[in-house]
């Protein structure tokens, strides 16, 4: 459960690739598409505003083997609009949302080795977003594997 | 109930070495960052040692006063952590604590009670 | 490294009354608009266990008496009201980065 419905802060922040490429949101047809792209030199980064939550995630109830605190964050690059799962089409979309959040735009933050930050699905553990064709899409994480991972791992620059 | 147990301290002679061991249980051990983190009155509490997942190839990070002689390691399979202490000194007596991250590996969050090494002749 | 300067080194309070115990890092433990500063308590013969984390928020089954703030560079745990149980030895410890350090500790005794 989030304790809480206010973020105990908020940041902004460029949201990059561990292989630098940018993630950018553009309007198209009155809704927005996210992009992984490389960015030329004088071309401003888009911002997106952090919200962090804490969380209580009693092992009990989730079976997963995690437990105590977490930071969640919710991802907004645009007033009204969050980053939200799907895990029907293991997409990564923007939806135009009212607050209380709905589950889906709730992110379990990582920290990762390298200066790095992995974002994982309140709504599936084990499911992170990633980076799959130039998108953003929702890659499912196995632990006791090797992966090396970089497809999930991602740079936050204020 | 989650739980870390460390055991292997005692008595070594400056030189000598020893290691130590913590078992997990409770909770899903690969999924977490762990340390240790060493206690005396001298020094008060000094982090020693992390080790991190096998998603990221396990990277390790040492205090720059045990690098080269302590080693740290892991056995997702045995639930376990370990410190090989090489060359041990003087200074490197003190209650040795394993210490789990929180989810997300953020902060300590979860500590044993301990393994006391002396390092005296 | 960063180093963490704890004050004061002890402190005596009444019971009831609030304890402030101060931490100040030798550069800013802020990363991703987070306050990586944690707090500890520790009691004789036991480890220590988190009360606070990221500044300000509480760790698992800690009383809503204590209470972390700041950010950047300084931060501050406080105590209220004080109750007997809560004389310990107290400290500070960054998250940032490695090596993470931790601060000289406060031993708080209850008047």
């Known amino acids: 459960s989030i304790t809480g419905i206010s973020p105990i802060t908020e940041s902004l922040a460029s949201l990059s690739t561990y292989n630098d490429q940018s993630i950018t949101f553009a309007l198209e047809d009155e809704s927005y598409e996210i992009y992984v792209e490389d960015l030329k030199k004088d071309k401003k980064k888009d911002k997106v505003l952090l919200s962090y939550y804490e969380s209580q995630h009693p092992s009990s109830e989730s079976g997963d083997g995690v437990d105590g605190k977490m930071l969640m964050v919710t991802l907004s690059p645009t007033k009204d609009f969050w980053l939200q799962a799907n895990n029907k089409e293991h997409s990564v979309e923007l939806h135009k949302c009212e607050k209380p959040l709905p589950d889906q735009a709730f992110f379990v933050l990582h920290n990762r080795s390298f200066n790095c930050v992995s974002f994982e699905c309140k709504t599936d553990p084990g499911v992170f977003i990633g980076v799959k064709d130039n998108h953003l899409a929702l890659i499912k994480v196995d632990y006791s594997e090797n992966l090396g991972s970089e497809n999930i791992l991602f740079k936050l620059s204020e | 109930e989650v739980k870390l147990e460390e055991s292997g301290g005692g008595l070594v002679q400056p030189g000598g070495s020893m290691k130590l061991s913590c078992v997990a249980s409770g909770f899903t051990f690969n999924k977490f960052w762990m340390n240790w983190v060493r206690q005396s009155p001298e020094k008060g509490l000094e982090w020693v040692a992390e080790?991190?997942?096998?998603?990221?190839?396990?990277?390790?990070d040492y205090a720059e006063s045990v690098k080269g002689r302590f080693t740290i390691s892991r056995d997702d399979s045995k639930n376990s952590v370990y410190l090989q202490m090489n060359n041990l000194r003087a200074e490197d007596t003190g209650i040795y604590y394993c210490?789990?991250?929180?989810?997300?590996?953020?902060?300590?969050?979860?500590w044993g009670a301990g393994t006391t090494v002396t390092v005296s002749s | 490294d960063i180093v963490l300067t704890q004050s004061p080194a002890s402190l005596a309070v009444s019971l009831g009354q609030r304890a402030t115990i101060s931490c100040r890092a030798s550069e800013s433990v802020d990363r991703y608009g987070i306050s990586f500063m944690n707090w500890f308590q520790q009691k004789p013969g036991q480890s220590p266990k988190l009360l606070i984390y990221?500044?300000?928020n509480q760790g698992s089954g800690v009383p809503a008496r204590f209470s972390g703030s700041g950010s950047g560079t300084d931060f501050s745990l406080n105590i209220h009201p004080l109750e007997e149980d809560d004389a310990a030895m107290y400290f500070c410890q960054h998250s940032k980065e490695v090596p993470y350090t931790f601060g000289g500790g406060t031993k708080l005794e209850i008047k």
């Open positions: 080790i991190r997942l096998n998603s990221i190839n396990y990277v390790k």
């Open positions: 210490i789990r991250r929180n989810y997300g590996n953020w902060f300590f969050e979860i």
């Open positions: 990221a500044a300000s």
